[in-house]
């Protein structure tokens, strides 16, 4: 009897998640089962299901399967958090790249290589054809999506809506082209799920056909999601166990990223004089083991043969014969030149001591000369002399080299928010240091805040179409989702960056968050064609006390008719009093039957002193805050609006002048709203965008 194939490997798992159908017309099929594998087999074969199964949920508590003809990207559906549920989505329907000739491609690209819209498969206009959905069952000839039902050479194609062009291939990349890794791929978290010879990978949470020790729950930081290629054990490149019982494991064909920028949260801190942690980041020149025996060169095979070569372990700095820790051992080590002693630890290298005395800075800390050498996020500072090239990239004068000694926190670029340093961690290239301003220091960090010298608008004009506000005008509005529900607003200020508030992040687990762009309805109803759902890859917290967060998207947003960026004001600028502004949000409206549509409230700018009076003198506003009062009594931002923008117009240019943060109740009559003044933090925002690497689209 032929062994039934285990198809669960064809699904992407989202733990603690289920799908709720908003559209009652959508069908669901349920049945009691024992395992998720049984659900998967039935979904793949569509056995006994009155629809094409695209996803299923396994209810672990009730031991029940729920099969769906839709997935999380479908319209009329929303994700919901639930401990007892696991969502499995067929990868073919969510993959945006092809494997081989793309026969299994079931994605939603519907535009040809030259940009022509595809003709629906069920239509005979403008081109008559025989590729009817009914004739090609299982090939998913839905809508006008690109497909390759016969597995032809060029990859997925479609008949075009242009009567002059009968058909054309679609420009869908090979998965092996899209996926790339840095170094030896230890930080790779991509979606490659087959080996270089084309074998399908075994799920990490399965023990068949091959038993193994790499259980996801035992190694939560190794990215053991589904059956994607990973490098948890310091191999030369990512690999996986295969579904072939005769091939235990194989490497995966993942190319090296062009710019080779690392994007790993676990990048070790580079040190040269001492060992931090297990010394994986040690880059010093000690070249003997603890008892003085010299090390063997890493590029030599004498006296000991090995595969720890510089070619196999890129980015591990296996230069000369220096002690290193390329494989996650307990500390730096090397092969020795003594034929009788293969390896030895270099335990004579001291541990780094990150202790520091307490101190403070005055003004913006440009004259701070203390010896703190650690960032507020706990990272050790890296040497200034190693980072001069980066520093020159974002300042336009020669920094005072006499101040930039060792790796101490300094402020060579006149940053308004205090001393900082480079870290040696590519994910967090630099950060502020945990030093406070000296008590009683009142030196302003921006001068002339109350004199409207600097205009907020840059010189370029905003394009207004016939002067009619359209949905395009709010394309920068972001709905931040926490566990599949709207939690906060945000503003898209760059394709990969969203400006929002610190208060919007109950959890530090980035998998709990998503950004929805291009929507008008908070549930995404009616926004399917324009909605973009993006994961969050990093949170960059603003300077101490700012309440700001820059949220980096896992991939850049695609700017189109529904998604656009909004401009930032000039640093330290002042907007004239009574300027008309607006706040936007999907938050609490005071209405019982809230329709979920984006709301706007119109406010006008109020000077800080006048604002303080309106708050009965109980509030003293500082240079980092901006005040705006409501034109209509009792309107203004509230819960769910936090993180969203205060948008003002100057010289026909719209800008995000403020960020909504919680504080003093919602829309209290005669109490103007107090927002974070974006102009005060504009240099910080630009510095982050300039220096933090963004993912390639």
């Amino acid at each position: 009897q032929r062994k039934r194939r285990n198809t669960i490997h064809e699904f992407k798992k989202s733990a603690k998640t289920t799908l709720i159908k908003i559209d009652p017309a959508l069908k669901i099929k349920t049945k009691k089962v024992n395992t998720a594998d049984q659900c998967a087999n039935r979904c793949t074969r569509n056995k006994g299901l009155p629809f094409t199964c695209k996803a299923f949920v396994f209810d672990k508590a009730r031991k029940q399967c729920l099969w769906f003809p839709f997935n999380s990207m479908s319209s009329g559906v929303k994700k919901e958090f639930g401990h007892e549920f696991d969502l499995y989505e067929n990868k073919d329907y969510i993959r945006n790249c092809i494997i081989g000739k793309g026969r299994s491609y079931k994605g939603t690209v519907s535009i040809t290589k030259s940009g022509i819209k595809c003709q629906p498969w069920s239509s005979m206009i403008p081109h008559e054809h025989s590729f009817l959905p009914s004739s090609y069952r299982g090939k998913d000839l839905q809508e006008n999506y690109c497909r390759n039902p016969r597995g032809e050479e060029g990859g997925p194609w479609c008949f075009t809506s242009n009567p002059e062009v009968r058909y054309e291939v679609c420009d869908i990349p090979q998965c092996s082209e899209v996926e790339c890794m840095t170094c030896n791929g230890e930080s790779y978290r991509g979606l490659m799920d087959h080996t270089e010879s084309g074998k399908i990978c075994q799920r990490w949470d399965h023990q068949t056909p091959h038993r193994h020790k790499f259980l996801p729950e035992r190694y939560p930081d190794k990215g053991f999601d589904d059956n994607y290629c990973r490098n948890p054990d310091g191999q030369p490149r990512p690999w996986c166990y295969t579904l072939d019982p005769h091939t235990r494991w194989e490497y995966c064909a993942i190319k090296t990223c062009a710019d080779n920028t690392m994007n790993d949260t676990d990048v070790p801190l580079e040190t040269t004089e001492c060992i931090q942690g297990q010394g994986e980041g040690y880059r010093g020149t000690v070249n003997t083991i603890w008892n003085g025996i010299p090390c063997q060169r890493w590029d030599s095979q004498y006296p000991h043969e090995h595969d720890m070569t510089p070619e196999n372990f890129k980015c591990k700095d296996l230069r000369e014969n220096y002690c290193r820790n390329p494989d996650g051992s307990e500390s730096p080590w090397c092969f020795t030149t003594d034929p009788n002693i293969r390896v030895g630890y270099c335990s004579q290298i001291p541990n780094c001591d990150m202790s520091h005395g307490q101190d403070c800075y005055r003004g913006n800390g440009k004259n701070y000369m203390g010896n703190l050498s650690q960032t507020r996020s706990g990272l050790t500072c890296s040497m200034w002399d190693k980072n001069m090239e980066d520093l020159h990239r974002h300042i336009f004068w020669e920094p005072d080299a006499s101040k930039l000694n060792e790796n101490y926190c300094r402020n060579p670029d006149d940053d308004a928010h205090g001393p900082w340093c480079y870290t040696g961690n590519p994910l967090i290239p630099w950060d502020y240091c945990p030093i406070s301003r000296c008590e009683g220091d009142t030196t302003p960090t921006i001068v002339n805040l109350d004199h409207p010298v600097i205009s907020c608008a840059k010189t370029k004009q905003l394009r207004v179409v016939n002067g009619i506000p359209t949905r395009t005008n709010i394309g920068w509005m972001v709905s931040l989702r926490y566990r599949n529900k709207h939690i906060c607003g945000g503003s898209l200020i760059k394709e990969s960056w969203v400006l929002t508030a610190r208060q919007c992040f109950p959890s530090r687990d980035l998998k709990d968050y998503e950004a929805w762009l291009g929507i008008h309805d908070v549930h995404g109803r009616g926004d399917e064609k324009c909605k973009q759902v993006l994961n969050v890859s990093q949170l960059v917290y603003g300077p101490e006390g700012s309440d700001l967060v820059l949220m980096k998207l896992a991939r850049p947003a695609v700017l189109d008719d529904f998604v656009s960026t909004i401009d930032l004001p000039n640093y330290g600028c002042t907007i004239p009093e009574k300027t008309s502004c607006s706040v936007y949000g999907w938050g609490y409206t005071g209405l019982i039957n809230y329709d979920g549509l984006l709301r706007v409230a119109h406010l006008y700018i109020m000077g800080n002193e006048k604002c303080s009076q309106h708050h009965r003198g109980k509030v003293t506003l500082n240079e980092s805050e901006i005040c705006a009062g409501a034109e209509k009594i009792g309107s203004g931002p509230c819960e769910g609006d936090y993180g969203g923008p205060l948008v003002c117009e100057q010289h026909k240019m719209r800008m995000v002048l403020g960020v909504i943060v919680p504080g003093r109740g919602c829309a209290i009559p005669n109490r103007p709203g107090i927002f974070v003044r974006v102009a005060y933090y504009a240099k910080w925002i630009h510095k982050i965008i300039l220096t933090y690497k963004v993912p390639q689209s």
Epitope: S377, S507, E639, P662
Partner: antibody, heavy 115, light 110 residues
């Protein structure tokens, strides 16, 4: 600074509400936690209230037994039906940084549950 | 569930000595771990946050390290004033938590 109030001697089953008041910062801008400590025992995290429409999170043992709320400019902890095991000093704390640690604590208020 | 286990429950140390307290998380919490010091009749006081960053006004004799699931607090050159109970606390996630704090370690200075 922070100050807790409302701690007193109550009989089992009598609901009790503790209040946390802030001075020197705007309480509405921060997540706030409640923590308790029974005499001679360690710190026990009860729960946290966020600044937005997300429901408060509670320790698994505290669900249903406590309710955290934000009436205007204070943060309240309601012990719904106290038992003798709820005798403890109750602290409120401001959650700072990246919302990941408590940087300001109140001095605590003592609740004694006894019949 | 992000539960915290602290060891030892109690430790005795001589003035000038070094004491090491360990804290283990049931799941990876990156570096979102804080250490607090509590003396009898007082609320806890923040010592270290983000696993290794010293809080304002805290002596550099206190040192935190670790990431993922294993963390350490080291007090070197112990002084009489260091006699207290020390607690670790995870700040990675607040949902589905039994106790965000470790059980505590009492440091007795001889």
């Amino acid at each position: 600074s922070l100050e807790e109030s409302g701690g007193r001697l109550v009989t089992p089953g009598t609901p009790l509400t503790l209040t946390c008041t802030a001075s020197g910062f705007t309480i509405g801008r921060y997540y706030m936690s409640w923590v308790r400590q029974a005499p001679g025992k360690g710190l026990e995290w009860i729960g946290i209230i966020y600044t937005h429409g997300v429901n408060p999170d509670y320790a698994s043992w505290a669900k249903g037994r406590f309710t955290i709320s934000r009436p205007s400019t204070t943060v309240d902890l309601k012990i719904t039906s106290p038992t003798t095991e709820d005798t403890a000093t109750y602290f409120c704390a401001r959650v700072g940084g990246f919302n990941d640690y408590s940087d300001i604590w109140g001095p605590g208020t003592l609740v004694t549950v006894s019949s | 569930a992000y539960d915290m286990t602290q060891t030892p429950a109690s430790v005795e140390v001589a003035v000038g000595g070094t004491v090491t307290i360990k804290c283990q998380a049931s799941e990876s919490i990156s570096t979102y771990l804080a250490w607090y010091q509590q003396k009898p009749g007082q609320p806890p006081k923040l010592l270290i946050y983000r696993a290794s960053t010293l809080a304002s006004g805290v002596s550099s004799r206190f040192k935190g390290s670790g990431s993922g699931t294993q963390f350490t607090l080291t007090i070197s050159g112990v002084e009489c004033a260091d006699a207290a109970t020390y607690y670790c606390q995870q700040g990675y996630s607040y949902s589905n938590v039994d106790n965000a704090f470790g059980g505590g370690t009492e440091v007795v200075v001889k």
